[in-house]
Interface confidence: low
């Protein structure tokens, strides 16, 4: 019975040099054969000649010829077992077999590392018929070998549903060293040790490594790959690379820049995104990070008013999202704003200062010393007050809003009056007699209406009462001032 040996993927053997059954070449063609120019017996083993012992699969035909002579076993001829060549060279190798003419439809397929080679490969099968046998030569050529062409190649032939397998042909592609690990760019702290790694492979092995710093070799004695270089520390940026050498020559890795961490550059493009009476939203574009991630930023704010005491307010924030709302500012004020950011090394300089202004706001305090009294002769209530301090007006005063609430026998009615900004007194008509009038006043700017003053109450008697006295804003501590006349 015929057995089938499936070729498993396996590494090609590494030999130190040429040996019986191997061929070292950088040339094309290798073992090339004539193209249909006739039979060349010198390159063939005749089926009738005794062959060397063979490890490939053998098919023993059961069919006999007319003369009833048994047919010899079928097997691929021995050929070169190991081809060593350089990358990008061409190579051609073949399998040959002599098949009795009684067999029809024989096909040969090529396999590499256990997988059939289909399609894009250059394989040619040639037939050289004779009286009794046909010599079949299957050639396989690669015009420019790559490392990926390394491996074990075999031929397979199917006859009568049986499979014949050739000895393997090992292809070993040698070339310049190939990097499997190159040094990586790094950002390091000044005068602090760090490691760089370099690894390269052949074939051919061994691969030796030299390190290069700023175009000068670091080690005069090569190290076997892989190599780790320990740099005790740098004071300035340097470029490192490694050279990998083998018998074919040398390959140089990419040059990598080792940067020294430094303080960041100052932020740029500080912009005012919006401003309100008491806050300013700013954004900025971070400067160069000094090869170390930003940790946080500091917003420095000082009053631009030449009469201010020049003190600087500091607001700390995270480095992202380059946006900050500065709060608790005064209304209608000018500020100089600068931004500084830090990384693990330290703080950047402050950005160019920009000028920003807050808008008008509603006043933050109510009018002071509100006094209310009854002018019975004219049936009016007179109201007087003092305007709030300028600093707390938060804008240009445009007037006052007066709320007066009249309460009598369960009925309550609120009325609002507007007064121009120059006034500090107002007169309102008595709405209801025998009632309590509660007065509150708020200052008004274009930014809005401020808080109302504490309520001041006055009792308006029925017609005919004569005595009256003023009501006024209470001294601190009196919760609900009422003056009953």
């Amino acid at each position: 019975a015929i057995t089938e040996a499936r070729e498993e993927a396996k590494p090609y053997p590494l030999f130190p040099g040429p040996f019986p059954g191997s061929l070292q070449t950088d040339h094309t063609p290798l073992l090339s054969l004539p193209h249909a120019s006739g039979y060349q017996p010198a390159l063939m083993f005749s089926p009738t000649q005794p062959g060397r012992p063979h490890t490939g699969n053998v098919a023993i035909p059961q069919v006999t010829s007319v003369e009833s002579k048994p047919l010899p076993p079928l097997a691929f001829k021995h050929t070169v077992g190991h081809i060593i060549l350089s990358e990008h060279k061409g190579v051609k190798f073949n399998c040959s077999i002599s098949v009795p003419n009684i067999y029809q439809d024989t096909t040969i397929s090529w396999w590499k590392d256990g997988k059939e080679l289909l399609g894009a490969h250059h394989a040619i099968t040639q037939f050289y018929p004779d009286d009794e046998v046909t010599a079949i030569i299957a050639s396989f050529s690669i015009t420019s070998v790559q490392r990926s062409d390394n491996g074990s190649y075999i031929c397979k032939m199917k006859i009568n549903n049986e499979e014949i397998v050739s000895d393997p042909i090992y292809i070993e592609v040698q070339g310049l060293p190939h990097f499997t690990k190159q040094p990586e760019s790094m950002n390091v702290t000044r005068n602090t040790a760090f490691n760089l790694t370099c690894q390269a492979v052949g074939p051919p092995e061994p691969v030796n490594i030299f390190w290069v710093q700023n175009s000068s070799r670091v080690n005069e004695q090569p190290e076997k790959s892989p190599s780790v270089l320990t740099v005790p520390g740098l004071t300035e940026m340097a470029v490192f690379s490694c050279e990998a050498h083998n018998d074919k020559g040398l390959t140089v890795s990419k040059g990598v820049q080792i940067n020294i961490k430094a303080i960041p550059s100052p932020p740029t493009e500080v912009s005012i995104r919006n401003s309100t009476a008491h806050s300013i939203l700013i954004s900025w574009v971070p400067g160069f990070d000094g090869y170390s991630p930003f940790r946080n930023c500091s917003i420095q704010v000082k009053e631009a008013d030449p009469l201010s005491n020049g003190s600087v307010m500091i607001f700390n924030t995270s480095a992202l999202p380059h946006l900050y709302q500065i709060k608790q500012l005064q209304a209608l004020a000018n500020y100089s704003i600068g931004v500084s950011c830090m990384n693990e090394i330290g703080w950047s300089a402050v950005s160019p200062w920009i000028l920003a202004s807050t808008t008008e706001g509603a006043p933050s305090v109510a009018p002071l010393n509100v006094t209310v009294f009854l002018n019975e002769s004219s049936d009016n209530v007179d109201i007087r007050w003092m305007k709030p301090p300028t600093k707390q007006q938060d804008g240009e005063l445009v007037g006052y809003r007066i709320s007066h609430v009249w309460q009598s026998a369960g009925i309550s009615k609120e009325l609002l009056e507007e007064v121009g900004q120059n006034g500090s007194r107002a007169r309102i008509s008595v709405q209801v007699h025998n009632a309590t009038c509660t007065v509150r006043i708020a200052a008004v700017t274009r930014g809005g209406v401020g808080p109302f003053s504490d309520p001041v109450k006055i009792f308006i008697p029925a017609h005919g009462w004569v005595d009256y006295a003023p009501s006024s804003t209470p001294a601190p501590g009196n919760a609900d001032p009422v003056l009953i006349i």
């Epitope: 740029t268 493009e269 500080v270 912009s271 005012i272 919006n274 954004s283 574009v285 380059h322 920009i354």
Partner: antibody
């Protein structure tokens, strides 16, 4: 992906008001200011104003302060611009545009063509 | 408010030519942005922070300038560059202001 969807066209009579919409998708609506820009036929771009969806704070170009009111609906990620007392001068394409952290108008709607005509 | 004046208002150039559009500010600004707009479409952010190209903008475009004088340059004009270009500032704001635009046509 970031998208700002605006109705293609609106036709209104002089003196009326109109509310233009801009529906945002593909990003966190409250994190980015929304701007509105006007472009009259064959003319350049004019900035109307901007609104911060996190707290509805708006800044206006003084020229459009009495004409436009910016608002939004966070639940539907939609920004609105109300234009009042319309005249033929208000006929234009109105764009909404998203503003990133650096103040760049990085995504724009397709624009709504407003025609004011009797 | 800062007024931006673009020049020229309209220009025509041949493919392969170098083209420069300028934008002059009435007072100093920190940086400039540029937008490209083609007929019937929305403006597209083209250059930001004076000289940085927005995503997808070809490398033949560049921006430069400082203070009150800024420019957009196309090193070798291509047919697809025909459009109107607007400069925009927001370092003095509000309001944000745009230039009146430069219409670039192909000869």
């Amino acid at each position: 992906q970031v998208q700002l969807q605006q109705p293609g066209a609106e036709l209104v009579v002089p003196g009326a008001s109109v509310r233009l919409s801009c529906k945002a998708s593909g990003y966190t609506f409250i994190n980015y200011w929304m701007h509105w820009v006007k472009q009259r036929p064959g003319q350049g771009l004019e900035w109307i104003g901007e609104i911060d969806p996190s707290d509805s704070y708006a800044n206006y170009n003084q020229k459009f302060k009495d004409k436009s009111t910016l608002s939004l609906d966070k639940s539907s990620s939609t920004a609105y611009m109300q234009l009042s007392s319309l005249t033929s001068e208000d006929s234009a394409v109105y764009y909404c545009a998203r503003c990133d952290y650096y103040g760049r108008l990085d995504y724009w709607g397709q624009g709504t063509t407003l025609t004011v005509s009797s | 408010q800062v007024v931006l004046t673009q020049s020229p208002a309209i220009m025509s150039a041949s493919p392969g030519e170098k083209v420069t559009i300028t934008c002059s500010a009435s007072s100093s600004v920190s940086y400039m942005l540029w937008f490209q707009q083609k007929p019937g479409t929305s403006p597209k952010l083209w250059i930001y922070s004076t000289s940085n190209l927005a995503s997808g903008v070809p490398a033949r475009f560049s921006g430069s300038g400082s203070g009150t004088s800024y420019s957009l340059t196309i090193s070798r004009l291509e047919a697809e560059d025909a459009a109107t270009y607007y400069c925009q500032q927001r370092s003095s704001y509000p309001p944000i202001t745009f230039g009146a635009g430069t219409k670039l046509e192909l000869k």
